[in-house]
């Protein structure tokens, strides 16, 4: 191959690359706590991610502190979780082949 | 109010494979951030939990019994079933199963079905 | 797969006794421990969640302290209707696991 020949991927549908990350899908945190949600994944091409909050589109705009959306790392962290955190987020990644999401729960103490 | 109740064959011999059934009422378990799981305590010994199903199909199981398990749902019919293949006589106990909501603790829980292995 | 030691094995107490049973976590296991009740030819009832959160309907000389790997279930004055096996449960991490449970017995 020269260099300037680049080698075509095959599409391949989004897939989670540390699934033992996400084997913990109930995260009870005290009032006032950090929590992270992370889902690694991988695809061709490359897949972006979402997030829902009980089944609707989850930006964090009507949230205190709001929330920060890490893509590199496939992750939302929410800082100073108050009761009306809690709920179901589910991680919605897709690409042009496929789509994968995976809920995790939230119960705030 | 909540019920939970299992039902199963009662006796089977070694090699056979051994069905149970969770039938429940009070929730569904189409709901967000539900669970079901079986656990089974040998008489007069501990508790050992088996299997859990979520809502949302989700299920995880005891590595050390994994490739003899299978956890299902009816989410329609209310009933949670469990599996396990090649039994033998350190499989005689008491089988319960068990809910968690938004919870990984037990809150409701049936009154156990006793399965006995014999040749 | 993470371990729950309980201790004592037995215990042996008089009505109006306070008491407190140990369970310990072969491994940090933060406030992911829960607390049920069994007595005999009955199912267990749940009695504390998350370590020290109280339960509905759970009489209030029942309480939990603890988080990491050391924690404790606490009764102010025992009552005879007390009288049974106590397992602690941890969920912390797959498989969930429970401890080997305490026997509570009339002295």
């Known amino acids: 191959l020269e260099a300037s020949e680049e080698v075509e991927l095959e599409p391949q549908a989004p897939y989670w690359t540390h699934p033992q990350r996400m084997e913990k899908k109930l995260h009870a945190v005290p009032a006032g706590n950090t929590v992270k949600f992370r889902c690694p994944a991988a695809g061709n091409p490359t897949p972006t991610i979402r997030w829902l909050k009980d089944g609707q589109a989850f930006h964090g705009e009507n949230r205190i502190g709001g929330i920060r959306l890490r893509h590199q790392h496939w992750s939302l962290v929410m800082e100073s979780v108050v009761p009306s955190d809690r709920g179901t987020y589910t991680c919605l990644v897709e690409n042009a082949v496929g789509s994968i999401r995976y809920n995790y729960l939230l119960d705030v103490l | 109010q909540v019920t939970l109740k299992e039902s199963g064959p009662g006796i089977l011999q070694p090699s056979q494979t051994l069905s149970l059934t969770c039938s429940f009422s009070?929730?569904?378990?189409?709901?967000?951030?539900?669970?079901v799981s079986w656990i089974r305590q040998p008489s007069g010994k501990g508790l050992e939990w088996l299997a859990h199903?979520?809502?949302?199909?989700?299920?995880r199981y005891n590595p050390s019994l994994k490739s003899r398990l299978t956890i299902s749902k009816d989410t329609s019919s209310n009933q949670v079933f469990l599996k396990i293949t090649s039994v033998d006589t350190a499989d005689t106990a008491t089988y319960y199963c068990?809910?968690?909501?938004?919870?990984?603790?037990?809150?409701?829980w049936g009154q156990g079905t006793t399965l006995t292995v014999s040749s | 797969d993470i371990v729950l030691t309980q201790s004592p094995a037995t215990l042996s107490v008089t009505p109006g006794d306070r008491v407190s049973l140990s369970c310990r976590a072969s491994?940090?296991?933060?406030?992911?421990l829960h607390w049920y009740q069994q007595k005999s030819h009955e199912s267990p009832r749940l009695l504390i969640k998350?370590?020290?959160q109280s339960i509905s309907g759970i009489p209030s000389r029942f309480s939990g302290s603890g988080s990491g790997t050391d924690f404790i279930l606490s009764f102010n004055s025992v009552e005879t209707e007390d009288f049974g096996m106590y397992f602690c449960?941890?969920?912390?991490?797959?498989?969930?696991?429970f401890g080997s449970g305490t026997k509570l017995e009339i002295k």
């Open positions: 068990a809910r968690d909501y938004y919870a990984s603790s037990f809150d409701y």
């Open positions: 009070g929730f569904s378990l189409s709901t967000s951030g539900m669970g």
């Open positions: 199903i979520y809502w949302d199909d989700d299920k």
């Open positions: 491994q940090s296991i933060s406030n992911y």
């Open positions: 998350y370590a020290s």
């Open positions: 449960q941890q969920s912390n991490s797959w498989p969930f696991t």
